[in-house]
């Protein structure tokens, strides 16, 4: 089982959308695949895929999941808020026919405030 995640780095503006993609491949067929997205180590969602369908369509705040055969699992955050910033990891495990698991590399999501002055004020509030 192989998991490839992208992009490595994603910078978006608050209120826009962010798309994280996880490509899951295995040489042989699988009957049920458990997938998981985490943000900063905390689980956002942990659905499974069977018969070509996801058991769950939502994933964390403003997050929507989709599965596109043969191998693409997409997490779409819309609209993006400042607290969406963080490190996202996709994990997958074949549960049937036999257990095999893998995880992707981190996607770092940076959310820029809609009002650039918010960023300046926030930085200014941490004296050096």
């Amino acid at each position: 089982l192989s998991v490839q995640q992208g992009p490595n780095l994603l910078q978006v503006r608050q209120g826009s959308q962010a798309t994280l993609v996880c490509q899951v491949d295995q040489a042989t067929a699988w009957e049920r695949l458990r997938v998981k997205w985490t943000k900063d180590g905390a689980i956002l969602c942990q659905p499974y895929i069977t018969n070509g369908s996801l058991s769950l369509g939502v994933c964390g705040p403003q997050g929507r999941l989709s599965w596109q055969a043969p191998s693409h699992l997409t997490l779409q955050l819309d609209p993006v808020s400042l607290n969406h910033s963080g490190a996202y990891v996709c994990w997958a495990a074949v549960e049937i026919p036999e257990l095999e698991e893998a995880e992707g590399n981190i996607t770092r999501l940076f959310v820029d405030p809609d009002d650039p002055t918010q960023n300046r004020n926030r930085i200014a509030s941490f004296p050096g």
């Epitope: 089982l1 192989s2 491949d25 295995q26 040489a27 042989t28 067929a29 699988w30 009957e31 695949l33 895929i49 069977t50 018969n51 070509g52 055969a69 043969p70 191998s71 026919p97 095999e100």
Partner: antibody, heavy 120, light 113 residues
């Protein structure tokens, strides 16, 4: 260019252990998502999958041979090996090593094959 | 184990004529999860190792002439050669990788009349 090359004795006595090594060049066997396989072809030309060792070190064997087969690897030499114990004349075959990737699942690269004869 | 059955076992063909090989599996090789058929075709030319022709039932491998085509889904698959050439002689194998143990058909020997 990926190349695989089988090596080992061409003649093995009945009841002994057949040992073959596959040396991989042009590609690291530790690269994620790859299966390193052994396949044999009997004199009648029938192809039989023996088993593989995956990137993680996990192995999978053909149930018809499982009790007699061990596939291992030496990452420092970029090699993987086959051991088949208690051989009989029915194990006489051309033995191939081949790779397979999670992205695809087909045997992309094959060695040239080595004939192993089991005879006293 | 999934049993792969090929027909015919021997196929004499006149150069320039079409050829067709059938492969049937004992269970479906189609996955509803990936929308793929886990079936590949190989050609083993005399004195050589097998080489990939078709993957996932219908996709031609890199460098394979377009006279080769694969079709079918589920349990019934076909390899077609639109116009046979002398260099196409050898043994053709179908192979499933839906599950382990990976299994091959018994082979179809194509020869020139």
């Amino acid at each position: 260019q990926v190349q695989l090359q089988e090596s080992g004795p061409g003649l093995v006595k009945p009841s002994q252990t057949l040992s073959l090594t596959c040396t991989v060049s042009g590609f690291s066997i530790t690269t994620g998502g790859y299966y390193w396989n052994w396949i044999r072809q009997h004199p009648g030309k029938k192809l039989e999958w023996i088993g593989y060792i995956y990137t993680s070190g996990r192995t999978s064997y053909n149930p018809s041979l499982k009790s007699r087969v061990t596939i291992s690897r030496d990452t420092s030499k970029n090699q993987f090996s086959l051991k088949l114990s208690s051989v009989t004349a029915a194990d006489t075959a051309v033995y191939y090593c081949a790779d397979m990737a999670d992205k695809g699942g087909w045997f992309a690269y094959w060695g040239q094959g080595t004939l192993v004869t089991v005879s006293s | 184990d999934i049993v792969m059955t090929q027909t015919p076992l021997s196929l004499p063909v006149t150069p320039g004529e079409p050829a067709s090989i059938s492969c049937r599996s004992s269970q479906s090789l189609f996955s509803s999860n990936t929308k793929r058929n886990y079936l590949d075709w190989y050609l083993q030319k005399p004195g050589q190792s097998p080489q990939l022709l078709i993957y996932h039932a219908s996709y031609r491998a890199s460098g394979v002439p377009d006279r080769f085509s694969g079709s079918g889904s589920g349990t019934d698959f076909t390899l077609k050669i639109s116009r046979v050439e002398a260099e196409d002689v050898g043994v053709y194998y179908c192979q499933q990788h839906y599950e382990t143990p990976l299994t091959f058909g018994q082979g179809t020997r194509l020869e020139i009349k």
